[in-house]
Structure formats: C-alpha cells, structure tokens
C-alpha cells in the first residue's frame, strides 16, 4: 500500500528520517504570540503558569484568540503560508491575539511519528487553554483554532481535551493518511468545537490522498470538487517554477486551503459561496445551487455557524488565484427533440451577456448524456460579475476536439454513411444565479427558429416574464 508523504514537505518514495541528526531534542510545544504585523518580529512566547508575558505582550483577554497550528514538516522550518495567515488575521481582526503553535521538533519526524505526536500537542494546547480560562474575562467561546494538514487533527485533539468547548475549529485540508476512516476521537470531528468548518483541497479517490476525503466537520467544503485546483496543474507549476515537479503540484493543491482562508480574511468584499450537495458530480451538473434551508454558506472565515444534525458537504468553483470568487449559474436547457444524434455527445458552449460585462465562451460540461424530451442541467461559472443577464449565445461546436469523439464519429459514419444532419431543438434556457439566487428564463430570439446543429449557434433573450424570484434566500452572510 502507498506510504504517506509530506503534506508540507517533499514528495518521497518512502518514509525516511529528516536530514537532521537529532541531539538533545526536547518534546516541546511553544506558543508564540505574534505581537506585530511585521513577520520578522520574534513575538512573545507564552507558557502555562507564567502570567508576565501576557502582560508584557498585551494579551487581550476579551478579544478573539486564534491558534495557528502547522502540520508535518520535512525542513524543520515554518512554511511560508504561516506568515501570510498571521498577517491576514492581524489585518482583519486588529485587536485579536494570534498565537502560532510551534511543534516543529515533534513535526520534523517520520510522518508516522509526527502523527503519533499529534495527541501530545493537542494536550499541550488544551493545557494552555485551561490555564487561560483561569484568567478573568478569557472565554473559550472566543477561541478559534486553525489547523493545516496534520495541524487540523491536532486542533481536534485540543478541542477534545480542553475543559469546556472551543468556539471554532477550522480544518485546512486535514491530513488523510492514517486518519481516513478513523474513529471520531482520533481525528478532527464535529464534537471538537462549537463550530467545525473544513476546507478540502487535495483529496484523491485514486492513489494516495494527502488530504482527508471524508467529511469531518459541521460543514465540509470541497472547492473544485476537493481535488484538482485551478492554477495547480503541472503546466501552471512548470510555468512559474523552472524545475517544477509533481511535488509542487501536491504543495499547491494542499496549500490552496490556506490561501482560500486567507482570501476570505482579506477580501471580505468578495466572499466565495459554497452550495450543499450530496456529491461532486451532482454539483458539476448544476443541480445544487440552492440557498434554502441553510444550503449555501460563505467559505473560510466568514462561514456562518451551522450545526447540522448531519454533516453538510458543500461545493464551489474558484479562480486560480486571489480573489478566488467566481459567479455560479445553473442552466436548465429543455431539449424537446433531436435528430440523428448517433453515439456522440454534442459539445456546447455558452456566452453570457450582462449589464456589467460579457463572459468568455464557457463550455457546458456534459456529466452523463444529453437527454431528449427532458430538462438537462448544467453548471457554468464566470470570473467576473456580469450583472443582470441580458442574452445568451449557445454554440454547438462543429469539428470534434477529442480523439474519442472523432473515433465515435468515424464509427457512426461507418454504420450510417449517409447520416443526415444532426439537429437539436431548444426553446428556452432557464438560468439561476447561485450568488443572487435570482432565476430568469431566456427564449429563442426567433420563436420559429429553435433548432441548432453542429457549427451553428442559437441566440436567447430574456423572456417577457423577466426575473422570477422564488422566495429563496440570497447567500448574503453576516460577517463575523
């Protein structure tokens, strides 16, 4: 079976000891209060039973307190994401206490040993929180633990061991190896805090999944399906890194959870919304863009507290970089007849025209197949805010772009050489905006011309009934 490798380190064929020769290792956890936005500042070290540093370093007992918990490390140094997150928290919550949990000596080990150390580190954090609770005005409800990778499970242990209930735990792509399918007391779980929200960015159903696939929080958000993150493909990575490798892809996708969270802190005017759905395929079909009954939520720091009886899996698409927000649209296309479709699925593209901007040409992903005499649902998303939609251009691509489709066309031709022209009839397209929850119906410009065939296009304009609002709540979220 595949062996775990380093979420925050180098991709290795096998586990091995870090390059350090270990002498005089203290099994230690340090708590560094980041007292300045300057990342070079050494900060203040807090220790249980010593009240002086709390006073010297102006620890604010009534403010929010964030604990940032790193994960496994091959290098023994703090990864660069940590400083970004510290800075973003300081920017967003000026009075808050930001504490970095430094467990590098225990994380700079074999992955399996680091996993075994998570419990010890969780205990240390719980002890610190228990001690802080003895102080006047300090409230556990104001504590927000933010754990990346292995650090997410450390946060889970801390929440489990502390006397009382921590306000919130955010798991940023919690580690998968040795935690997938584990008992709830041996991993991050919803009972570890009053609110547990999780971002999954590197899950794989084949091979080794660096991030945990299973839902482990009250809400589990899977950006881009939780696996392939835009801007993290080998081509993207090779573009920015001369000697880019699969390792860089792993790091990019795994770390994307941190950047999504940072984005939610610094770009609060551009919140990204996720939508509840049973699985990624259904989301890709555009079925799940509802905000009724708490079915949508802001992601990252701005997430609304939801304590569902059942775990809530949520999905969204994102851009390749900050700000990550995109605008989701559900497109319902009723195909009322088609001719000579043969074996191959058509390749459709849409262009959306709005009051603010026009979209690029967007592909309609056919998840299964086009059904006739049925409503086919698609998900499209744009990087820019188009405003109110005015018209839609639907294009059926002519020449096949894939070898598979070419082969199917060739087979179709062999079995039916005089295959008359393929044709599809569409009268209207219903569009729903995920972000505004508004619904609109578009009709063909010419009611007599509803047919579309390969290499042709069909134009749709807003039908006379205009915008239809269906008593649905907009995903606008009160910011914390």
């Amino acid at each position: 079976s595949p062996v775990p490798f380093g979420p925050e380190g180098r991709l290795e064929d096998k586990l091995h000891k870090p390059k350090a020769t270990q002498t005089e290792v203290k099994p230690s956890v340090r708590f560094n209060l980041r007292t300045s936005k300057d990342p070079e500042h050494e900060g203040c070290y807090l220790s249980v039973g010593h009240s002086q540093p709390l006073e010297d370093c102006s620890f604010n007992m009534t403010a929010k307190t964030f604990f940032i918990i790193h994960g496994w490390t091959m290098s023994g140094i703090f990864e660069n994401w940590l400083h970004k997150l510290v800075s973003a928290l300081h920017t967003r919550e000026k009075d808050a206490n930001v504490v970095v949990v430094d467990w590098l000596p225990l994380a700079h080990q074999l992955y399996t040993d680091a996993v075994n150390n998570t419990r010890v580190v969780g205990h240390s954090i719980a002890r610190m929180l228990d001690w802080l609770q003895e102080k006047d005005d300090f409230s556990l409800g104001n504590v927000h633990l933010i754990g990346y990778s292995l650090g997410a499970h450390v946060a889970g242990y801390a929440g489990n061991f502390v006397k009382g209930t921590v306000g919130r735990i955010t798991g940023l792509d919690p580690a998968g190896p040795m935690f997938e399918g584990a008992d709830i007391h041996k991993r991050l779980s919803p009972d570890d805090a009053d609110f547990v929200d999780v971002l999954h960015t590197y899950t794989r159903s084949f091979g080794l999944s660096i991030g945990i696939q299973m839902p482990v929080g009250h809400i589990d958000i899977y950006p881009n399906g939780g696996d392939f993150q835009p801007g993290c493909g080998l081509n993207d990575v090779l573009g920015s890194i001369a000697y880019g490798t699969i390792t860089e892809v792993v790091k990019c996708e795994h770390e994307r959870a941190v950047h999504l969270f940072v984005d939610s802190l610094v770009n609060q005017d551009k919140p990204s919304f996720a939508f509840q759905c049973t699985d990624s395929n259904r989301f890709k079909k555009g079925i799940c863009l509802s905000c009724r009954k708490n079915r949508c939520n802001s992601i990252g720091y701005n997430a609304k507290k939801m304590r569902n009886k059942r775990n809530s899996k949520m999905y969204l698409k994102t851009r390749a970089g900050m700000p990550f927000r995109v605008y989701h649209y559900q497109m319902k296309i009723h195909v009322f007849s088609y001719k000579n479709m043969g074996e191959i699925e058509p390749t459709f593209y849409v262009t959306l025209y709005g009051t603010n901007a026009d979209s690029q040409t967007l592909p309609l992903e056919i998840v299964e197949r086009i059904e006739q005499n049925a409503t086919n649902t698609f998900l499209v998303y744009t990087e820019e805010d188009l405003g109110d939609l005015l018209k839609i251009q639907l294009t059926w691509e002519g020449a096949s772009q894939s070898w598979y489709n070419l082969w199917k066309e060739f087979r179709s031709y062999l079995s039916q050489p005089r295959n008359p022209g393929r044709e599809l009839n569409i009268r209207r397209i219903r569009v729903k905006s995920g972000e505004t929850q508004r619904k609109l119906t578009f009709c063909t410009e010419d009611p007599e011309n509803t047919s579309i065939s390969p290499g042709r296009e069909l134009w749709f304009r807003k039908c006379r009934d205009g915008w239809r609002m269906k008593n649905e709540t907009s995903p606008t979220v009160e910011l914390p």
């Epitope: 350090a20 020769t21 270990q22 002498t23 005089e24 290792v25 203290k26 230690s28 340090r30 560094n32 980041r34 300057d38 990342p39 070079e40 500042h41 050494e42 900060g43 070290y45 290098s75 023994g76 140094i77 703090f78 660069n80 940590l82 400083h83 970004k84 510290v86 970095v100 430094d102 590098l104 000596p105 700079h108 920015s240 890194i241 001369a242 000697y243 880019g244 950047h259």
Partner: antibody, heavy 120, light 111 residues
Framework: QVQLVQSGSELKKPGASVKVSCKAS????????LNWVRQAPGQGLEWMGW????????TYAGDFKGRFVFSLDTSVSTAYLQISSLKAEDTAVYYC?????????????WGKGTTVTVSS | DIVLTQSPASLAVSPGQRATITCKAS??????????MHWYQQKPGQPPKLLIY???NLASGVPARFSGSGSGTDFTLTINPVEANDTANYYC?????????FGGGTKVEIK
Amino acid sequence: QVQLVQSGSELKKPGASVKVSCKASGYTFTNYGLNWVRQAPGQGLEWMGWINTYSGVPTYAGDFKGRFVFSLDTSVSTAYLQISSLKAEDTAVYYCARRGYYGRRFFDVWGKGTTVTVSS
Amino acid sequence: DIVLTQSPASLAVSPGQRATITCKASQSVDYDVDSYMHWYQQKPGQPPKLLIYAASNLASGVPARFSGSGSGTDFTLTINPVEANDTANYYCQNTIEDPPTFGGGTKVEIK
C-alpha cells in the same frame, strides 16, 4: 547590543578535530535559529546548515553531512561547530549567523568569523 | 536547490556614479507578494552585513544610497551615488526554502 562572538583562529593538522564556538548576547538565544556559513579563501559564501536553538535539532546541507556537528549549550547561549577528520579543503573562515524562525529568514546578525587553517 | 547567478562578476565605478548588480534565480523566489531575496555587503576581512531584505527593504542602519528591486527570478541591487567606502563584495541570497543559497558575488571597486 545584539552580537555573536566567535572563538579565535585555529591551526590544525589533517585528521585532527576542531570545535568553533559562537556566543550570543543582547537577545533571547532560543528565539532565533543559528546558521553556519563557510567561506573558503577567495571564494563565496556557502550555507552549511543550521540548528534550532530551542529544540536542539540540527539540519545539515548536503555537503556537510558526516564530519560536521552542530551543538548547543543554551545555559551559556552558545552554539558550537565541530569538524572532525580535518582535510586541507576545510581551510576557510566559518561564520555563525542568526535568522528568525518567522518571516523571511534572512541572516540579520553575523559573527566576525573563525579562521580554520588545516595544514601539515 | 535554487541557483543564483550574479552579474557582473566585477565592476569598477567612479564615485558619484551609479552601480547596478543583478541576480537571477533558477526559479521564482516569490511567495504570494513577498520576495525571499536579500542582499549582503562584505568588505575585506569582515563578515557579511545585511543590506536589503525581501528584495526592496533597507536593513537597519543602511544608507538610502542602497536600493533593491525585482520580483520572481530577476533582482537588482543599486548603489547611487557610489562612495569610496562601498568597495566590497556583494552577495544575493534566497531563503524561500532550505537550503538558503547565495549568489557567486560581485566585486565592486571604486575608480
């Protein structure tokens, strides 16, 4: 003020060992990592590795595994570099330099350097 | 490991003139908006001294005649105007990941 004071020059024979010290003052020793940098005569700067002054965990660069050992005595805020089985090519100035655990980890404070000469 | 290539290897400048040294990295040393590129000055018989950190920030006590710029893989150290006591070797360094690496150095001489 913040400073790193290194031990004096050493003249050693091939095969011998040497231990260079670096004493920190003016700051909390365990709050910064301690790096070792080698500069051979007329050459550039070469990072040898570093030691986490809190945990005592050393990390060695590829060319410095084996004969080189980093150690600490936190009670006297001192880091040590020991080189065993000295060779002529170990002749160089050895610098200790401080870097933060946080931020961009540049080397903001340097010792004056210890010249180690290996000659028969 | 990231390789840093400095140019020119040596440079002779008259006092009052501008000296420009470049450093090219084999891969990007940027993380988000931060550049993990730094510059050091080493005078004969002395240890290196931090001049510029994070591509463009002047280290404490360094005169404003020194400035740094660049991002990604291409960085520049500028001394303007050059003074007689600027005779030294200048090194760039990256710390985006371990091992931190140094450029080969540029020897600046004052005419």
